[in-house]
């Protein structure tokens, strides 16, 4: 696995322990919590990052209205089960044998049940809507400048292929970033939109996952873009299955 050979660190994930115990004595970095070797040339999967975090010693409307099937991560942090590739296992259970099904970004998509609950497949989240509210500025940002800067950020910092940034909407003070990536579109080596969104979310909160890099300094034409609220909506390829009781609550 690629890692900085000179001092054996992981540029893309500071929640790792790196040592020269890879093949041929090369630097190998293991994610905290799981101990799985990670590829430091790209983003680490959200599942392994969550596991590491849990182990760490925390008018013309241009804005998109989230679909009725959009999920918001209301359950917060949990210690997930990851598969050998570092993806979320479809079924997650806690220490008290309460289980639920999750999507590819680890967000619950069913009611909670017991150990008999079946989650046949990991349902892919193919559309992510990142809803941001920026702090007041002297004037509105230029939409095309804002669009270009956010696309550049996802391309350069998170290594997400530009084709997966579907749109950037702006209606001061709200910014919406749409990420879309179907199963058929995602090629080997492509960064997953769920992982990119998670890195972005942590950056926005001032909790960068990158090793040694400064925090996120977002500027549009030199003007700081400071985010004061973030909401992320997740849309799955198959709609979630919640009981009517939850839907009417």
């Amino acid at each position: 696995h690629t890692a900085a050979q000179d001092n054996c660190t992981c540029p893309t994930n500071k929640m790792t322990v790196c040592s020269p115990d890879g093949p041929g004595g090369r630097c190998q970095c293991r994610a905290l919590g799981s101990g799985m070797a990670v590829d430091c040339s790209t983003l680490t999967s959200k599942c392994l990052l969550l596991k590491a975090r849990m182990s760490a010693p925390k008018n013309a409307r241009t804005l998109v209205r989230p679909s009725e099937h959009a999920l918001v991560d209301n359950d917060g942090l949990y210690d997930p089960d990851c598969d050998p590739e570092g993806r979320f296992k479809a079924r997650q259970c806690n220490q008290t044998s309460v289980c639920w099904c999750v999507n590819s970004v680890g967000v619950r998509r069913t009611d909670k049940g017991d150990l008999s609950l079946r989650c046949d497949e990991l349902v892919r989240t193919h559309h992510i809507l990142i809803d941001l509210r920026h702090r007041p500025t002297a004037g509105a940002f230029n939409h095309s400048d804002l669009d270009a800067e956010l696309r550049r950020l996802f391309r350069e910092r998170y290594r997400l292929h530009p084709k997966f940034v579907a749109a950037v909407h702006y209606e001061q003070p709200t910014i919406q970033i749409e990420l879309r990536q179907n199963t058929s579109q995602k090629a080997a080596g492509d960064v997953d939109i769920g992982d990119a969104a998670y890195y972005f979310e942590r950056d926005i909160k001032g909790e960068s996952l990158f090793q040694g890099r400064g925090g996120l300094d977002l500027r549009v034409r030199g003007e700081p873009l400071q985010v004061e609220r973030t909401l992320i909506y997740y849309l799955d390829e198959i709609p979630p299955k919640f009981s009517m009781k939850r839907l009417t609550a």
């Epitope: 115990d21 293991r30 070797a37 050998p84």
Partner: antibody, heavy 117, light 107 residues
Framework: EVQLVQSGAEVKKPGASVKVSCKAS????????INWVRQAPGQGLEWMGN????????NYNQKFKDRVTMTRDTSTSTVYMELSSLRSEDTAVYYC??????????WGQGTLVTVSS | EIVLTQSPATLSLSPGERATLSCRAS??????ISWYQQKPGQAPRLLIE???ESISGIPARFSGSGSGTDFTLTISSLEPEDFAVYYC?????????FGGGTKVEIK
Amino acid sequence: EVQLVQSGAEVKKPGASVKVSCKASGYTFTSYWINWVRQAPGQGLEWMGNIYPSNSYTNYNQKFKDRVTMTRDTSTSTVYMELSSLRSEDTAVYYCSSYRSGGFAYWGQGTLVTVSS
Amino acid sequence: EIVLTQSPATLSLSPGERATLSCRASQNIGTSISWYQQKPGQAPRLLIEFASESISGIPARFSGSGSGTDFTLTISSLEPEDFAVYYCQQSNSWPFTFGGGTKVEIK
């Protein structure tokens, strides 16, 4: 030459604690994980946990999580494994091992811990 | 945790014969497997790492193969000193785990 030298045999009473040391030499102590593995009489090998001496990051097998503590002293290139609330089933040979490039390449001679009333 | 299952538990063979030991993982672990030999009263000795990479100083008659979930340790021609217990161990993820062992005994 890489060497891991462990402390001598111990006899303990149930409920007591034991602290086994493992002194490393012949390599850069802070660069490689030290693992602890135990083997009960006539049984197989059981991984207890490990410590990365460079930053003292520890990772414990859930089975021992509440009873084991691994520490290190970089000035003496020594790692310690303390096991508390001992019971008779903890009677075993405890090995420290340096994890290098894939496998546990270097092993201490083992420390027999006997728990008996 | 990843469970490693070794088979057979005991292998009775004569010197000069070929020994084939199996280790099966409960999930895909790539090539993150090592093999050890242990004799009574001694610490284990590393034979193979990364499923098939030989260790300096280990006789060439010891070889390893496999990836994913199925792994094999082969001793091409048993020498008298090879009769011992053999363990596989995974280093794919924590907790690291060992197989239950295969005892190779003289027939």
